[in-house]
Interface confidence: low
C-alpha cells in the first residue's frame, strides 16, 4: 500500500573537524521509494557537487572533506507523492584546531603611547589566547591586557615592555603558536645634563657640557646665537644609550649657546633643547650716556610680553645690542622658572620692559623707563618674597654676574607716573580692573603699600613657555 514518507532517524547535530568526513543520516520509511533532497542553510545541495557524496537512495549525505565554511543547518526533505513532504534538520558544527589568522607583527612604538600586537584566531571551540614574552607567560596588569579579539594591548608603553612576544591560541583540540615578534620601544630625546652658563674674561677657554638620552640614541648639535657653531671643537662619546657632547670655545664675545638633542621616530623627529650663556666680565656695563636707536623687537624671549611690533630701545654701548639684550633677558628669564605663579608673569613683564625699554623715536632716540608704581607693584605686591631673596643673594655676592643686576631695576630711581604720565611706561599686565578681572587678583591678606592705577586690563598677552620637547 502507498505510504507517506516518515523520517525514522531525525538529523542530529554533527561535530566534525576540518578536513575530516561528516555524515548526516536521514532514514526514511515510505512506499513508493521517496525522492530525498538536501539543503544547507536553505540552499539546495546539487547531486553533482563533488564535495558531497549522497548514498543509500539519498538517505546518507557525506561531506568528504569538511571546511570551516561548511558549518550551518542541513535539512533533508523526503517526498514520494503520497501525503506531504517531510523534513528534518540538524546542525553541522565545524570543530577546528586553533589557527592564527592574523599573527602579530614587529612593532616600533614611542614610550608612553599605546601598542597593540594583533593575534586574531580561528577555531571551534573558540580558542583562548595568551601571550608569551621572552620565555615566560605574560602576566596581565593595569597596563597590559589581552583583548577579546586575542590582540595584546599595552597602555603607556615603557622601556621594559620591549622584547620578544608570541601569542598562543588554545582550545580542547590543540594549540597554535605565532612566530616570535619584536616590540621596540622608542624614547623621545631628553637632556640629562644641561650646559652651564659662564661669566669669563675676554680670550679665555670655556667647555660646555651637554648629555642626552633617548631611543634611538640622539644626535647633539650646538647652536651659537641662533646659528650653527662656527668655531670651537666638539668631542662626543656614547655609552648605554647616553650621548655626551663637549663644546670647547675660545671666548671673544658673549653668546647664547644651545644644545639640541634630536632623534628620529619614523618620519618624525623629537627634540630637546637646553641653553647656556657665556658672558664676558665688564662687557655688559652700559655707558653712562644713553646711546642707541629704536627698532622693532625681533627677539624670542619677550615675544609674549611686549606688545606686537613693539618699538624698543637698543643700546649701542653693546657691540651687538639686540644679541646682548636678548641674552640678558634670557639669563634672567631662566631664574624666573622657580618663582611663584603669582610672581612669575609680573616679573617677566618687568624684566622685558626694563631690558627692552619702550623707545621714543626722534632726533635723539630715547628709552622710556617703567613707571615707578609698576616696579613697586612687582617688588612689594606680586614678588615680595622673591625680591627679598634676590636682594639678599646680591648683598652676599652670590650673583657674580652684573648681568643679573642690570635686569633688575631700582624702583626708587624710576619716574613716577604722577609726575608726567608720558615720561614713563606702564605694564598693562599688572593692571587690575574690578569690573574686568582678566589678570591678577588683588592681594587679600594686607593692603599693598603701592597704588596700582585702575587702568583697563590688557589681555593682549599670555604668559607661555615653549615646551622642552617638540616634534618636527
Amino acid at each position: 500500500l502507498p505510504k507517506a514518507p516518515v523520517i525514522t532517524t531525525p538529523l542530529e547535530t554533527v561535530d566534525a573537524l576540518v578536513e575530516e568526513v561528516a555524515t548526516f543520516m536521514c532514514a526514511v520509511e515510505s512506499y513508493p521509494q521517496p525522492e530525498i533532497s538536501w539543503t544547507r542553510n536553505k540552499i539546495l545541495i546539487k547531486l553533482f557537487d563533488t564535495r558531497y557524496s549522497i548514498r543509500e537512495n539519498g538517505q546518507l549525505l557525506t561531506i568528504l572533506s569538511v571546511e570551516d565554511s561548511d558549518d550551518g543547518i542541513y535539512c533533508c526533505t523526503a517526498n514520494n507523492g503520497v501525503g506531504g513532504a517531510v523534513e528534518s534538520c540538524g546542525a553541522l558544527q565545524v570543530k577546528m584546531k586553533p589557527k592564527i589568522t592574523r599573527p602579530p607583527i614587529n612593532v616600533k612604538i614611542i614610550e608612553g603611547l599605546k601598542a597593540v600586537l594583533p593575534c586574531t584566531t580561528m577555531g571551534n571551540p573558540k580558542p583562548s589566547v595568551s601571550w608569551i614574552k621572552g620565555d615566560s607567560p605574560l602576566r596581565e596588569n593595569s597596563r597590559t591586557a589581552v583583548l577579546e579579539s586575542g590582540s595584546l594591548r599595552i597602555h603607556n608603553v615603557q622601556k621594559e615592555d620591549a622584547g620578544q612576544y608570541r601569542c598562543v591560541a588554545k582550545n580542547s583540540l590543540g594549540t597554535a603558536y605565532s612566530k616570535v615578534v619584536k616590540l621596540e620601544v622608542e624614547v623621545f630625546a631628553r637632556i640629562l645634563r644641561a650646559p652651564e652658563s659662564h661669566n669669563v674674561t675676554f680670550g679665555s677657554f670655556v667647555t660646555l657640557h651637554c648629555t642626552a638620552t633617548g631611543i634611538p640614541v640622539p644626535t647633539i648639535t650646538w647652536i651659537e646665537n641662533g646659528n650653527a657653531v662656527s668655531s670651537g671643537s666638539i668631542q662626543e662619546s656614547v655609552k648605554d644609550r647616553v650621548i655626551d657632547s663637549r663644546l670647547q670655545l675660545f671666548i671673544t664675545k658673549p653668546g647664547l649657546y644651545t644644545c639640541i638633542a634630536t632623534n628620529k621616530h619614523g618620519e618624525k623627529f623629537s627634540t630637546a633643547k637646553a641653553a647656556a650663556t657665556v658672558s664676558i666680565a665688564e662687557w655688559s656695563k652700559p655707558q653712562k650716556d644713553n646711546k642707541g636707536y629704536c627698532a622693532q623687537y625681533r627677539g624670542e624671549v619677550c615675544n609674549a610680553v611686549l606688545a606686537k611690533d613693539a618699538l624698543v630701545f637698543l643700546n649701542t654701548s653693546y657691540a651687538d645690542p639686540e644679541e646682548a639684550q636678548e641674552l640678558l633677558v634670557h639669563t634672567a628669564w631662566n631664574e624666573l622658572k622657580v618663582v611663584s605663579p603669582l610672581c612669575r608673569p609680573a616679573a617677566e613683564a618687568l624684566l622685558c620692559n626694563h631690558v627692552f625699554q619702550e623707545c621714543s623715536p626722534g632726533v635723539v632716540p630715547t628709552p622710556i623707563p617703567i613707571c615707578r608704581e609698576y616696579c613697586l607693584a612687582v617688588k612689594e605686591l606680586f614678588c615680595a618674597k622673591e625680591w627679598l631673596a634676590m636682594e639678599e643673594k646680591t648683598h652676599r655676592g652670590l650673583y657674580r654676574s652684573e648681568m643679573h643686576l642690570l635686569s633688575v631695576p631700582e624702583c626708587s630711581k624710576l619716574p613716577s607716573m604722577h609726575w608726567d604720565p608720558t615720561a614713563c611706561a606702564r605694564l598693562p599686565h599688572l593692571d587690575y580692573n574690578k569690573e574686568n578681572p582678566k589678570t591678577f587678583p588683588p592681594m587679600t591678606s594686607s593692603k599693598p603699600s603701592v597704588d596700582i592705577p585702575n587702568l583697563p586690563s590688557s589681555s593682549s598677552s599670555s604668559f607661555s613657555v615653549s615646551p622642552t620637547y617638540s616634534m618636527t
Epitope: E12, T13, D15, N41, K42, D71, G72, I73, C89, G90, A91, Q93, N124, P125, K126, S128, N171, S172
Partner: antibody
C-alpha cells in the same frame, strides 16, 4: 554601545499567550546567535531557547517545546519569543542574550535588562 | 536527568581568595562541556565572566580566573573586592547537543 532591550512582558492568565521582543543595537545582529534565558523570582537562571544567526534552526528546553517559538528578523534587528499555553511555572524575568558566535552554540556575552512575565489567574 | 551542581553559598574576606566549583550530579565536568561563568548582582542582568573553561570576557578584571580541576569546573577570585559580592552561575553544554545548555543553581558569594 551594544544594547539589548526586551519588551512585551506583563500579566497573563494560564493558557494565555504573550510575544516578547528584543531590539538589538550596537553590533551586527545577523552575525550572532541569540538566546532567551529566564529567571523565576528568587531562583536561578534557566536556558529557554536559542536560534543561530540565520534562523535556520531552533532549539528549546524540553519543558517549553511545542509551546514557545523563537524567531528573528535580521532586517529589524529583533529577536522574538512567542509564548503560548502559558503555565504558572513560566512566571519569570525573561532575558534576551547574545551568543558569542554565529551558531546557537557559545557563551552568552551580552544580556538585556529583562522583561517580567507573570502567569497568574 | 543530570543536574549541574554549585555550592549554595560561600564567603570570603576582602583581599582573600575563594574558589567556586561547578560539577555534575553524575560524571565529570571536562573542557568539552565548555564551562561558562556568569555574575549577577541584585536587580541586575547577568554578566559574562569566563567562557570555555578559562577565557576571560573583555573588561573582566584579571582577579577572575577559570579552570577545571578534578572532576569539576572552578572559578577562582584572587584578591576579592566588596563589589564581587553577587550570585555566580556556571553553565555547561551537556554532551555534544547544542540544544542542551544547562545552568547550575548558582552560588551566593558574600564578601565579609
Amino acid at each position: 554601545e551594544l544594547q539589548l532591550v526586551e519588551s512585551g512582558g506583563g500579566l497573563v492568565q494560564p493558557g494565555g499567550s504573550l510575544r516578547l521582543s528584543c531590539a538589538a543595537s550596537g553590533f551586527t545582529f545577523d552575525d550572532y546567535g541569540m538566546s532567551w534565558v529566564r529567571q523565576a523570582p528568587g531562583k536561578g537562571l534557566e536556558w529557554v531557547s536559542a536560534i543561530p544567526w540565520n534562523g535556520g534552526s531552533t532549539y528549546y528546553k524540553e519543558s517549553v517545546k511545542g509551546r514557545f517559538t523563537i524567531s528573528r528578523d535580521n532586517a529589524k534587528k529583533t529577536l522574538y519569543l512567542q509564548m503560548n499555553s502559558l503555565k504558572s511555572e513560566d512566571t519569570a524575568v525573561y532575558y534576551c542574550a547574545k551568543r558569542s558566535g554565529r551558531i546557537a552554540f557559545g557563551a552568552l556575552d551580552a544580556w538585556g535588562q529583562g522583561t517580567l512575565v507573570t502567569v497568574s489567574s | 536527568q543530570t543536574v549541574v551542581t554549585q555550592e549554595p553559598s560561600l564567603s570570603v574576606s576582602p583581599g582573600g581568595t575563594v574558589t567556586l566549583t561547578c560539577g555534575l550530579s553524575s560524571g565529570s565536568v571536562t573542557s568539552s562541556n565548555y564551562p561558562d561563568w556568569y555574575q549577577q548582582t541584585p536587580g541586575q542582568a547577568p554578566r559574562a565572566l569566563i567562557y570555555s573553561t578559562n577565557s576571560r570576557h573583555s573588561g573582566v578584571p584579571s582577579r577572575f580566573s577559570g579552570s577545571t580541576s578534578g572532576n569539576k569546573a572552578a572559578l577562582t577570585i584572587t584578591g576579592a573586592q566588596p563589589e564581587d559580592e553577587a550570585d555566580y552561575y556556571c553553565a555547561l553544554y551537556m554532551g555534544s547537543d547544542i540544544r542542551n545548555y544547562v545552568f547550575g543553581g548558582g552560588t551566593k558569594l558574600t564578601v565579609l
